[in-house]
C-alpha cells in the first residue's frame, strides 16, 4: 500500500489517500484495489496506463485535485470502471477525445467544473453504458453535432452554468433515454426547431437564465414525457412571433415556471402564459440589431431578417421599424392562432402560480421541481412571498433519485456502487 | 452571510405545546429547504422533518408523525417547528437547519450546511 | 429506515495523531453520506458532503471516503480544537438517518 494510504478489504478491496499533499499518482497501488480515491490532493497529470494493473476498479475519484492534463491512455485496461469523478480540476479546460475509450461499463462521468472549453470531437464515443454525465460550471461554448451520439442510455446531461449559445439540430442526437437536461445559466438565445427531436423520454428541461428572446414549439412538440419546464429569467419577447409558444404553454399540463416578458415594454414583467391572446399583438423592436428565431422555414418568408407576422403591411412599417412606437391593429397576426396551436377552452380557469423557482402546479400535474443552481450562488429572482409548499406526507422510505430532481418515488437505493438510482 | 435565527428557550407542562421560530436574514426562505433536528441532553442527533425540495413538500420522521408540524411565513421569512401533546423526553435542543442540496448544482448533493443555534425546550411538571 | 453505525464510540489520542472514524449503512447509500462536528453547547458544523467533498472553510486535514455502505472520516495531524463529536448522517433518502456519534478526546 502506497506509504500516503490507506488499503483495505472490505466490503470493497479499497485504496484510499484523500487530501494527503500528493502530486502524482501514487505507485504501488494494489492490483486488486475495486476502489480508488485520490481526490484533494495536488495531482497534476495522470500519466498513461496510471491504474492498467487494476483491473477489478470500479470507482476512481480524482475529483478537487489540480489536473491540467489526463494522457490520453490514462484510463487504459479499466474495462470495468463504473465511477470516475475528475470534477473541480479547474486547470484541466480541455480533455483528449479518446481519454475515454474503452470505458465501455462506465455509467457515471463527473467533468463539472473542470474549466472545459470545448468538447472534441467522439470524448463520449463508445459510452454505450453512461447514464449520468455531469458538464455543469464549465466555459463550455458550443455543442458540437453528434457529441453524445453514442450515449443512448444516458439520462442525467447537465450542461448548466456554462457559456453555451445556441442548441444546434444535431447537439442532443441519439439521446433517446434522456430524463432530465438541464441547461439553465448558460447563454442560449437560439433553439433549433428540432434539437429535441430524440428526446421522447424527456422529462425535466431547465432553460431559465439564458438569452432566449423566443423559442420555436416545434422543438417542443417532440416532448412527449416533458412534466417540468423552466423557462424563466430569458429576455421573452411577447409579440405576435410568441403566440405559438404561448398556445402550447395554455396546453401544457406540466409544471412549467412562469414566463416573464420583457418586450414590448407594456407587457414588460408580465408572465406570457397569463396574457389573452390578443394581447400578442404587433411586433416589438428591441434596439440593436434583430436576431431572428430558427423557424425552419424558407427565408423568402422572412424577407426583412422578420417572421412572417412581423412583416409590415405597407402603410404600417414604422410600427416595425421605429421601436417605442405602439404597435398597430393592423400589424397583428394575419389570420389566427396556427392549426393546432389553438388554446383550450375556459374549463380549467386560471393556472395556479406557484414561487417561480417552482413554477406553474396545474391540478393534474406532479408536484413541481425545485431550483438547482451552482453551488454557493445566488438564484435570481427569487420571490419573498407568495405560496410555496404542499402539506406534508410520511412516505418515509423513498429514496431520493441520483440528482433529486425526480418524481415522487422515483429512486431506488441502487446496487453496489453504482450512483444512479 | 445567511443565518438561521431561533425564538429564546422555554418551559412547558406535559400535555402542552410548543412552537420554535428560525429567521432566516441574509436570504429569502422561499429560496430554502429548511429542516429540523433535535438532541436530547448528552444523547444524539435526531431528524425530524423538513422541506422534501425534490417532491415539493414537508416529510417527517414517523416518530413524530402527527405531533409535529412545521409551518413558514415567507413575508417574514420565518420557519417554524410546532410539537404538540409534549412529554419529558421531549426535553431537547431543537435546531432548524438548511439543507445544502438545494442549492447545489446538479450534483445535488443533500447536507444541513448552515444551522441554527439551538432552542432549549424543558418538559416537566 | 437506514440505521447508521459509527464506529469506535468514543477515541483518545494525541496532537498530531491520525484518526479514523468509520460509518457503517445498513443499506446501499452511494455516495450520499455527511459528516458533522459538534462541540458542547454549539450547534453541529458541517465538514464533508456526498462522503468525499469538504465544506468551504472546513481544514484539509479532515478528509471523507468511502461509498456503498461504509465510509470513513480521517483526520490527519490532530489539532486541540479537534476535540469534539462527530456524526454523520445519511442523506439517500428519508427520514434523514445519523449515526450515533464518536466523542473525540485530546490526550
Known amino acids: 500500500c502506497p506509504g500516503a494510504c490507506v488499503c483495505y478489504n472490505e466490503p470493497k478491496v479499497t485504496t484510499s489517500c484523500p487530501q494527503q499533499g500528493l502530486q502524482a499518482v501514487p505507485v504501488g497501488i494494489p492490483a486488486a484495489s475495486q476502489r480508488i480515491f485520490l481526490h484533494g490532493n495536488r495531482i497534476s497529470h495522470v500519466p498513461a496506463a496510471s491504474f492498467r494493473a487494476c483491473r477489478n476498479l470500479t470507482i476512481l475519484w480524482l475529483h478537487s485535485n489540480v489536473l491540467a492534463r489526463i494522457d490520453a491512455a490514462a484510463f487504459t485496461g479499466l474495462a470495468l470502471l463504473e465511477q470516475l469523478d475528475l470534477s473541480d480540476n479547474a486547470q484541466l479546460r480541455s480533455v483528449d477525445p479518446a481519454t475515454f475509450h474503452g470505458l465501455g461499463r462506465l455509467h457515471t462521468l463527473h467533468l463539472d467544473r473542470c474549466g472545459l472549453q470545448e468538447l472534441g470531437p467522439g470524448l463520449f464515443r463508445g459510452l454505450a453504458a453512461l447514464q449520468y454525465l455531469y458538464l455543469q460550471d464549465n466555459a463550455l461554448q458550443a455543442l458540437p453535432d453528434d457529441t453524445f451520439r453514442d450515449l443512448g442510455n444516458l439520462t442525467h446531461l447537465f450542461l448548466h452554468g456554462n457559456r453555451i449559445s445556441s442548441v444546434p439540430e444535431r447537439a442532443f442526437r441519439g439521446l433517446h433515454s434522456l430524463d432530465r437536461l438541464l441547461l439553465h445559466q448558460n447563454r442560449v438565445a437560439h433553439v433549433h426547431p428540432h434539437a429535441f427531436r430524440d428526446l421522447g423520454r424527456l422529462m425535466t428541461l431547465y432553460l431559465f437564465a439564458n438569452n432566449l428572446s423566443a423559442l420555436p414549439t416545434e422543438a417542443l412538440a417532440p416532448l412527449r414525457a416533458l412534466q417540468y419546464l423552466r423557462l424563466n429569467d430569458n429576455p421573452w419577447v411577447c409579440d405576435c412571433r410568441a403566440r405559438p409558444l404561448w398556445a402550447w404553454l395554455q396546453k401544457f399540463r406540466g409544471s412549467s415556471s412562469e414566463v416573464p416578458c420583457s418586450l414590448p415594454q407594456r407587457l414588460a414583467g408580465r408572465d406570457l402564459k397569463r396574457l389573452a391572446a390578443n394581447d400578442l399583438q404587433g411586433c416589438a423592436v428591441a434596439t440593436g440589431p434583430y436576431h431572428p428565431i430558427w423557424t425552419g422555414r424558407a427565408t423568402d418568408e422572412e424577407p426583412l431578417g422578420l417572421p412572417k407576422c412581423c412583416q409590415p403591411d405597407a402603410a404600417d412599417k414604422a410600427s416595425v421599424l421605429e421601436p417605442g412606437r405602439p404597435a398597430s391593429a393592423g400589424n397583428a397576426l394575419k389570420g389566427r392562432v396556427p392549426p393546432g396551436d389553438s388554446p383550450p377552452g375556459n374549463g380549467s380557469g386560471p393556472r395556479h402560480i406557484n414561487d417561480s423557482p417552482f413554477g406553474t402546479l396545474p391540478g393534474s400535474a406532479e408536484p413541481p421541481l425545485t431550483a438547482v443552481r451552482p453551488e454557493g450562488s445566488e438564484p435570481p429572482g427569487f420571490p419573498t412571498s407568495g405560496p410555496r409548499r404542499r402539506p406534508g406526507c410520511s412516505r418515509k422510505n423513498r429514496t431520493r433519485s441520483h440528482c433529486r430532481l425526480g418524481q415522487a418515488g422515483s429512486g431506488g437505493g441502487g446496487t453496489g456502487d453504482s450512483e444512479g438510482s | 452571510q445567511m443565518q438561521l435565527v431561533q425564538s429564546g428557550a422555554e418551559v412547558k407542562k406535559p400535555g402542552a405545546s410548543v412552537k420554535v421560530s428560525c429567521k432566516v436574514s441574509?436570504?429569502?426562505?422561499?429560496?430554502?429547504?429548511i429542516h429540523w433536528v433535535r438532541q436530547a441532553p448528552g444523547k444524539g442527533l435526531e431528524w425530524m422533518g423538513g422541506?422534501?425540495?425534490?417532491?415539493?413538500?414537508?416529510v417527517y420522521a414517523q416518530k413524530f408523525q402527527g405531533r409535529v408540524t412545521l409551518t413558514d411565513d415567507t413575508s417574514t421569512d420565518t420557519a417554524y417547528m410546532e410539537l404538540s401533546s409534549l412529554r419529558s423526553e421531549d426535553t431537547a435542543v431543537y435546531y432548524c437547519?438548511?439543507?445544502?442540496?438545494?442549492?447545489?448544482?446538479?450534483?445535488?448533493?443533500?447536507?444541513?450546511?448552515?444551522w441554527g443555534r439551538g432552542t432549549m425546550i424543558t418538559v416537566s411538571s | 429506515d437506514i440505521q447508521m453505525t459509527q464506529s469506535p464510540s468514543s477515541v483518545s489520542a494525541s496532537v498530531g495523531d491520525r484518526v479514523t472514524i468509520t460509518c457503517r449503512a445498513s443499506?446501499?447509500?452511494?455516495?450520499?453520506l455527511a459528516w458533522y462536528q459538534q462541540k458542547p453547547g454549539k450547534a453541529p458544523k458541517l465538514l464533508i458532503y456526498?462522503?468525499?467533498r469538504l465544506q468551504s472553510g472546513v481544514p484539509l486535514r479532515f478528509s471523507g471516503s468511502g461509498s456503498g455502505t461504509d465510509f470513513t472520516l480521517t483526520i490527519n495531524s490532530l489539532q486541540p480544537e479537534d476535540s469534539a463529536t462527530y456524526y454523520c448522517?445519511?442523506?439517500?433518502?428519508?427520514?434523514?438517518?445519523f449515526g450515533q456519534g464518536t466523542r473525540l478526546e485530546i490526550k
Open positions: 437547519a438548511r439543507d445544502l442540496g438545494y442549492l447545489t448544482s446538479g450534483n445535488y448533493y443533500d447536507a444541513f450546511d448552515i
Open positions: 441574509g436570504y429569502t426562505l422561499s429560496g430554502l429547504s
Open positions: 422541506f422534501d425540495s425534490e417532491d415539493d413538500e414537508t
Open positions: 443499506q446501499d447509500i452511494n455516495r450520499w
Open positions: 456526498a462522503a468525499s
Open positions: 448522517q445519511q442523506t439517500n433518502n428519508f427520514p434523514r438517518t
